[in-house]
Amino acid sequence: IWSAVFLNSLFNQEVQIPLTESYCGPCPKNWICYKNNCYQFFDESKNWYESQASCMSQNASLLKVYSKEDQDLLKLVKSYHWMGLVHIPTNGSWQWEDGSILSPNLLTIIEMQKGDCALYASSFKGYIENCSTPNTYICMQRTV
């Protein structure tokens, strides 16, 4: 059973979220479960390091984008939120908290100003930002 959930503060339009846990989960209480991932959007603004610590304290990590298909609800996310992508100055690459490298063609990331951390925005966009800038953030937990 699927329900059209309109989470006005999070998404630009209706997002299909499964109602029953048999399709997805388990997830922490009040988190969004979608295609075997648990997501939570946190409204308080923190810098990247504080956001990472907050997610870790809940046995989660900052958002990792790995699949446009499995994470299609992210297309519609409103505003800008810290995700778990960071710049590694030693080799110039961008990688996720788990050490994996950013896959090509998953995100269109623009560096409008110098920075080593990245914000997620709608339509699989990313914005590079100074890590010390306060922003809201998305935590994610894999269920499988």
Epitope: W94, T108, I110, E111, M112, K114
Partner: antibody, heavy 123, light 107 residues
Framework: EVQLVQSGAEVKEPGESLKISCKNS????????VGWVRQMPGKGLEWMGI????????RYSPSFQGQVTISADKSINTAYLQWSSLKASDTAMYYC????????????????WGQGTLVTVSS | EIVLTQSPATLSLSPGERATLSCRAS??????LAWYQQKPGQAPRLLIY???NRATGIPARFSGSGSGTDFTLTISSLEPEDFAVYYC?????????FGQGTKVEIK
């Protein structure tokens, strides 16, 4: 081959509206950002703003915020720059360009440019 | 916004000579600076990005150096086609900005 082809020169009167275009080809239009730069007669270059054609997310330089509108139609790979009420001071050459991708990240330089559209505003 | 000041305004040199163009930023832009060449009636062309990287197809006689606030574009031996206006541009902070340009003219 990446190409950006701009619409032709325009001569307008003050107060008139105008929309100029920049047709992009030879690459995935929705994987890059496109921008506009102004060059007034005999002067240097000024960033106006940039747009992500995937969802029309737009960023304007403060000097141009509210003065122009940047838009894009991803179905025809075209970016636009428009004015609702032209002034004589809008007389300039306008260039569109594609932002560079370096190590998978879009960075703030134009690697490809349109040929320019000359806009003349005079009564 | 970050102001870029280029010097000199005009550089008069002969073919085969070395050209040294300067760009100074009002605050640090790290290495986030590019150089463009513009010939009369043409769009600019990206020469150097992020201070020292040559863009695709740019001859080796063009080189860039510097970081922080002081940058240099060097043309090791001027060819006839190099006489043009050169602009620097920073992308360290939005709005991105250009310098006012240096004209390299034939002496």
């Amino acid at each position: 081959e990446v190409q950006l082809v701009q619409s032709g020169a325009e001569v307008k009167e003050p107060g008139e509206s105008l929309k100029i275009s920049c047709k992009n080809s030879g690459y995935s239009f929705t994987n890059y950002w496109v921008g506009w730069v102004r060059q007034m007669p005999g002067k240097g270059l000024e960033w106006m703003g940039i747009i992500y054609p995937g969802d029309s997310d737009t960023r304007y330089s403060p000097s141009f915020q509210g003065q122009v509108t940047i838009s894009a139609d991803k179905s025809i790979n075209t970016a636009y720059l428009q004015w609702s009420s032209l002034k004589a001071s809008d007389t300039a050459m306008y260039y569109c360009g594609r932002l560079t991708m370096f190590r998978g990240i879009i960075i703030g330089y134009f690697d490809y440019w349109g040929q320019g559209t000359l806009v003349t505003v005079s009564s | 916004e970050i102001v870029l000041t280029q010097s000199p305004a005009t550089l008069s040199l002969s073919p085969g000579e070395r050209a040294t163009l300067s760009c100074r930023a009002s605050q640090s832009v790290s290495s986030y600076l590019a150089w463009y060449q513009q010939k009369p009636g043409q769009a600019p062309r990206l020469l150097i990005y992020d201070a020292s990287n040559r863009a695709t197809g740019i001859p080796a006689r063009f080189s860039g150096s510097g970081s922080g606030t002081d940058f240099t574009l060097t043309i090791s031996s001027l060819e006839p086609e190099d006489f043009a206006v050169y602009y620097c541009q920073q992308r360290s902070n939005w709005p991105w900005t250009f310098g006012q340009g240096t004209k390299v003219e034939i002496k």
